[in-house]
Interface confidence: low
């Protein structure tokens, strides 16, 4: 018999099915059975861990510890689940050069035969952008495309109005600078930039997910928060009300609490089993 | 607003166990972030000693893993350093602190800090 | 370990310059760092992290820069509060190793 849930590894989770709890010759689901953002489901006699984030196609790229590239941090999430090792964010952008697998100490990169990973030129591409090493110099393209954006005026921490959040990431991009979305609507000096200009600005913002979002926290005069409010919401969205000092979190369904830290058992998933009910 | 507070004894004797609390208000320990303990010996720099994460997984400075436990009280959200053998050298203001989750590990918010003077 | 230095362990400048500290770390730590200032018989605070990015709430005349193995912080505009020590942070492995300290005194 396997010695833990991580030796039923699937390629979509894991399938426990068979596996011998010797006091309730049931193996139950409990808060850790499944770490790393996994979803514990038990069907009859099959404990089974799945992955399914939700993730969307935007192209923010990140490189993990493990010296793999993501396309952007949901799918690295998504691999540390289904792998159930810790997978940290060690930049913005994509890994520069492979580096060696395995465990050791290193917090930002793969840490096997190479003691560390050599730094490229490509290093110096941030905000989005990707970099062309077959340029005799070095070159930073973004191959951002705004055109299909919807309008949701926002006020950038440039002190300048763009037509939505694409076009600061854009514009971030092209002038290799952290520009952060810091309000709804247009400045106040009503300053806008609403094309690609060379002046323009785009920051790898994560709030530029999707417009529908970004619409529906301007209804309720939210703003998503900083960058440096990562994690503070477990399992929901990080929004920061001009009223409030403190950030707010909007939780995803079947969470609750401050930092939708807690399952909200409100919320009834029915497992098809022998079991008659189970909270997934 | 998040604080942490540190509280311990101010004195122990060389080879006995330093034992310090860190109480955290304004946000849960279990729901993110990691919780380091840092120390300062008079008039140096900063040393970090280890971290104790959301989800109760620790790591170690190396200097001290032999001597070094990190622990934690979800009920009371407070996390604990233990230091045992402790010598002359290891005293210093020791200071509890939050650091960020998902790659980046600065520390955004600090105790007041606590001095420990280790003598006989 | 990673060692962080700090080449001048003090400096001497005054209300309203442009100073710069600077950082080295003994390996490419990426971009895996972070700046504090200690002001005297009270705990660290963050200024910068990931190298250039600024803590909510600090003041606009810190700025942050450099990547691999070379980092600099910059007040472009010295005021009184800003007399204190300043250490840099790398968390690119571990254990986490912070530098010397660098003073900031009134000239």
């Known amino acids: 018999f396997p010695t833990s849930l991580s030796d039923c590894q699937t390629p979509t989770g894991w399938n426990c099915s068979g596996y011998d709890d010797r006091e309730n010759d049931l193996f139950l689901c409990d808060t850790n059975t499944c770490k790393f953002d996994g979803e514990c489901l038990r069907i009859g006699d099959t404990v089974t861990c799945v992955c399914q984030f939700k993730c969307n196609n935007d192209y923010v790229p990140v490189c993990g510890s493990n010296g793999e590239s993501y396309q952007n941090e949901c799918y690295l999430r998504q691999a540390a689940c289904k792998q159930q090792s810790e997978i940290l964010v060690v930049s913005e952008g994509s890994c520069a050069t492979d580096a060696g697998s395995g465990s050791g100490d290193g917090v930002h990169e793969g840490s096997g035969e190479t003691s560390q990973k050599e730094t490229s030129t490509c290093d110096i591409c941030q905000f989005g952008a990707e970099c062309d090493e077959d340029a005799e110099d070095v070159w930073c393209v973004c191959n951002i495309d705004c055109s299909q954006t919807n309008f949701n005026p926002l006020c950038a921490s440039d002190g300048k109005s763009y037509d939505n959040a694409c076009q600061i990431k854009e514009a971030s991009c092209q002038k290799q600078e952290k520009i952060e979305v810091m309000s709804l609507g247009r400045c106040q000096d009503n300053t806008t930039t609403t094309t690609k200009s060379e002046d323009g600005h785009y920051a790898r913002t994560d709030y530029a997910e999707n417009a529908n979002k970004l619409e529906e926290s301007a209804r309720e005069h939210h703003i998503p928060c900083p960058e440096h409010y990562n994690g503070f919401c477990m399992h929901g969205k990080c929004e920061h009300s001009i009223n409030m000092q403190e950030p707010s979190c909007r939780c995803d369904a079947g969470y609750t609490g401050q930092h939708c830290e807690k399952k909200d058992y409100s919320v009834l998933y029915v497992v098809p089993g022998p079991v008659r009910f189970q909270y997934v | 607003d998040v604080q942490l507070q540190e509280s311990g004894p101010g004195l122990v004797k060389p080879s006995e166990t330093l034992s310090l609390t860190c109480a955290v208000t304004?946000?849960?320990?279990?729901?993110?972030?990691?919780w380091s303990w840092i120390r300062q010996p008079p008039g140096k720099g900063l040393e970090w000693m280890g971290f104790?994460?959301?989800?109760?997984?620790?790591k170690y400075n190396p200097s001290l893993k032999n001597r070094i436990s990190i622990t934690r009280d979800t009920s009371e959200n407070q996390f604990f350093l233990k230091l045992s053998s402790v010598t002359a050298a290891d005293t210093a203001v020791y200071y509890c602190?939050?650091?960020?989750?998902?790659?980046?590990?600065?520390?955004?918010?600090w105790g007041q800090g606590t001095l420990v003077t280790v003598s006989s | 370990d990673i060692q962080m230095t700090q080449s001048q362990s003090s400096m001497s400048t005054s209300v309203g310059d442009r100073v710069t500290i600077t950082c080295k770390a003994s390996?490419?730590?990426?971009?895996?760092v972070a700046w504090y200032r200690q002001k005297p018989g009270k705990s660290p605070k963050l200024l910068i992290y990931?190298?250039?990015n600024r803590h909510t709430g600090v003041p606009s005349r810190f700025s942050g820069s450099g990547s691999g193995t070379d980092f600099t912080l910059t007040i472009s505009s010295m005021q009184p509060e800003d007399f204190a020590d300043y250490f840099c942070?790398?968390?690119?492995?571990?254990?986490?190793?912070f530098g010397g300290g660098t003073k900031l005194e009134i000239k």
């Open positions: 602190a939050r650091g960020l989750r998902r790659g980046d590990y600065s520390m955004d918010y």
């Open positions: 304004g946000y849960s320990i279990t729901s993110g972030y990691y």
């Open positions: 104790i994460s959301y989800d109760g997984s620790n």
């Open positions: 390996q490419n730590v990426v971009t895996a």
């Open positions: 990931s190298a250039s």
């Open positions: 942070q790398q968390y690119s492995s571990y254990p986490f190793t």
